[in-house]
Structures are given as structure tokens and as C-alpha cells.
Amino acid sequence: IWELKKDVYVVELDWYPDAPGEMVVLTCDTPEEDGITWTLDQSSEVLGSGKTLTIQVKEFGDAGQYTCHKGGEVLSHSLLLLHKKEDGIWSTDILKDQKEPKNKTFLRCEAKNYSGRFTCWWLTTISTDLTFSVKSSRGSSDPQGVTCGAATLSAERVRGDNKEYEYSVECQEDSACPAAEESLPIEVMVDAVHKLKYENYTSSFFIRDIIKPDPPKNLQLKPLKNSRQVEVSWEYPDTWSTPHSYFSLTFCVQVQGKSKREKKDRVFTDKTSATVICRKNASISVRAQDRYYSSSWSEWASVPCS
């Protein structure tokens, strides 16, 4: 048993049919010694008396808020949550496996630049009685500070007969050095509590591996005289690290016809302009990627040819 926060405790339960459970001793936080009784949740049934209460925790029915009283007065509370392990595997019931980039991906994180700021998000089908707490650090043995905000509900969508909820959190490395080579990964830890169930989820990554630039901005077309060609120009996104001479991007320019089946013409360039042939009803799209490290491409920025 360990303390999650004040008066909230997590019992780690290795569960299997007929498992003996975990013996837990609760102590009433009071100088009183006599006349103390214990109850669970809203029940008035007295579970025991004395300054300590020993219980055998076998299932969720044994979890909840234990209260010690004396003469009708509440002395203290202890909320017991369960963290369940089955066949040697901790439960992962609260969050949905996003399966990207691989199975058992519950947390996904992205950074728009090398400033040490990043966003993580996760999915659940649970709509009520749900709380999240997020902690992060650089490295784990001698951790360096990363400050995370509160997790917030960022999107809701319907998937079949299910509603899916997306939560996200923003974190910032306290002493980020954008130009430095990373040697220790960022660790992100999410505590999830649903009703009386506790679960924890972790992700470990280097900022360089989760970089996804914003799309190029100010995408413009300039027709070239007496030609079907156009000059496409764009700028680095505002959110990208500076100076651009050091934090350089490479770009992919694509000409796409109205039909998805039409052949796409693609040009790769390190410049912020390119010359392409603009077909009728086609559109021109540009996306960006770190020039020196193959992390994710940005989303496309697009303009119609006409």
C-alpha cells in the first residue's frame, strides 16, 4: 500500500480467483485512543473498533472511503483505491490503446519545436468519475524538472456505438536547451483514477523523436508568364525554432488532381519556393519536416490551382 495523495492510498492487488488478497492496516489520524469505530463509505455498519482497523482487500468491494468516528464525530478518512495486476500484468482498462505507432501505445506526445514544450494526449470511453494527474521529468535516476499543466478534455467523438473522449496536457522542460544533443529521455507518467480503480501509464521519448512542425504558412502561387508553371512560395511556421539557419526544415510540394486516383506530382526542396505545373482543378500542398532528423512531417498546407 502506498499514498497517492493526502488520505488517498493505493493497494496493489495481485488478483486471481481465490487469491487471498492484501492485508491492510488503517490507522485513525487522531490522538484519541478509546471509543473509536470504523465504517466504509455511506454504510452505518461498524466494521471494527480501535485506533487501527485490519482488513483483507480481495476485490473492489473492499475498497472505498474508510472513516473512523468517535461519539458521532468524524476523526479521519482513508480512501482506498485498487491497482490490479492479473497474470503479472497491471490493468490498462481506463485508457484506450491507440495502436500507433505500435500496440500498447496509450499516451502519444508531440512537440512543434525544440523549445522543450510538448503536448501529450490519450483516449478513453469513460465519461464520469475520472481523474488524471500528470508528472514528467528528464531522466529518471537523477531527474531534471519538467512542469505539466492539468489534463483537460480536448475532444469528443463518436466511434460506432461508443463515445470517445480525448484528454491532453501541455508540459514544458524547466531548463530546456534547444540546440543540445539529448542524452536522457523525457519521462511522462499519468495517474488515472476511475471510481475506485487506479492505473498508471508511462511514455519515454526524446524531443527530437516527437517533433512535428506546424504546416508552412503564407502559401502563395505566382503564375509564370506564358507558361502553365507557377511559382509556389511559403514561409516557416511561426512556432518553429529559430534561427532557421540552424533549425532548418525541408519541404515536400505536391500537386494533387481533384480525383484521389490521379497521379500526384511531388517535389522535395530545402528552399521556401518551388516551380510546379498547375493542372486545372488541382491543388498544391506543402508540408515540412526537420531537415537533419527524420521525425514526423507536418500536416499539409494547401491552396487551389485556379
Partner: nanobody, 123 residues
């Protein structure tokens, strides 16, 4: 919301078998831990069995262990309770329940309930 409808109850002789079904509709059945409870006249609702959503792990009350088997078919959105070697003390209204916590024998850990099906075991 999940709607639960039990069926399969009836009158049997002691020692005989019966299979109860609980059909779920509404939100995704596979997101829920499922349980069976029973209530005899003048008594509190009593836990019978539960089955987990992921691994179909099972959990039984001592009084039915070895005699009753709970199972689920996520494709059919149905949970079953196979009852054998029935005794007169198994007579009760049997309720199907859906919740978020497995294992739990506590009725208030279940969020959705069916209307119940009567099982009567005569000696």
C-alpha cells in the same frame, strides 16, 4: 446508457440445471464488467458471479462455486449464467448488472441493472 434484459428463468426441480441469458443494448457491451446478483424475498441483493470485459476472468460467490458458470459473448452482446445442481436455496430473482470494476461483489459498484428473471427451485 446500457439496457439489460434477462431471460431463461423458470421453475425446476432440485438437482436440475437452468441457463440464464442477459442481452445488452445501447453503448458498447465490451466496455463493461458484467455480473449476476440474486434477491430472495425479504433479503438483500446477493452477489452470484462476475466476468471481466477483457480476459473473461471470472469471480464467484462461495455459495455457487463449482455449480454455476458465468460466460459472455461480446459478439452477441450477451452474458450467460449456467446453473447446475440447483438447490431450493437458489430460489430468487436473478439480476444482470454492468459496471466498471472487476472483481466486485458489491452491488453499488455496478451502474446498470436489468429487471430480473425469477428462478424457483422446488424440492
Amino acid at each position: 446508457e446500457v439496457q439489460l434484459v434477462e431471460s431463461g428463468g423458470g421453475v425446476v426441480q432440485a438437482g436440475e440445471s437452468l441457463r440464464l441469458s442477459c442481452a445488452a443494448s445501447g453503448r458498447s457491451f465490451s466496455n463493461y464488467e458484467m455480473g449476476w446478483f440474486r434477491q430472495a424475498p425479504g433479503t438483500e441483493r446477493e452477489f452470484v458471479a462476475a466476468i471481466s470485459r477483457r480476459r473473461s476472468s471470472t469471480y464467484y460467490a462461495d455459495s455457487v462455486k463449482g455449480r454455476f458458470t458465468i460466460s459472455r459473448d461480446n459478439a452477441k452482446n450477451t452474458v450467460y449464467l449456467q446453473m447446475s445442481s440447483l438447490k431450493p436455496e437458489d430460489t430468487a430473482v436473478y439480476y444482470c448488472a454492468a459496471g466498471a470494476l472487476f472483481p466486485s461483489s458489491r452491488s453499488r459498484d455496478y451502474d446498470y441493472w436489468g429487471q430480473g428473471t425469477q428462478v424457483t427451485v422446488s424440492s
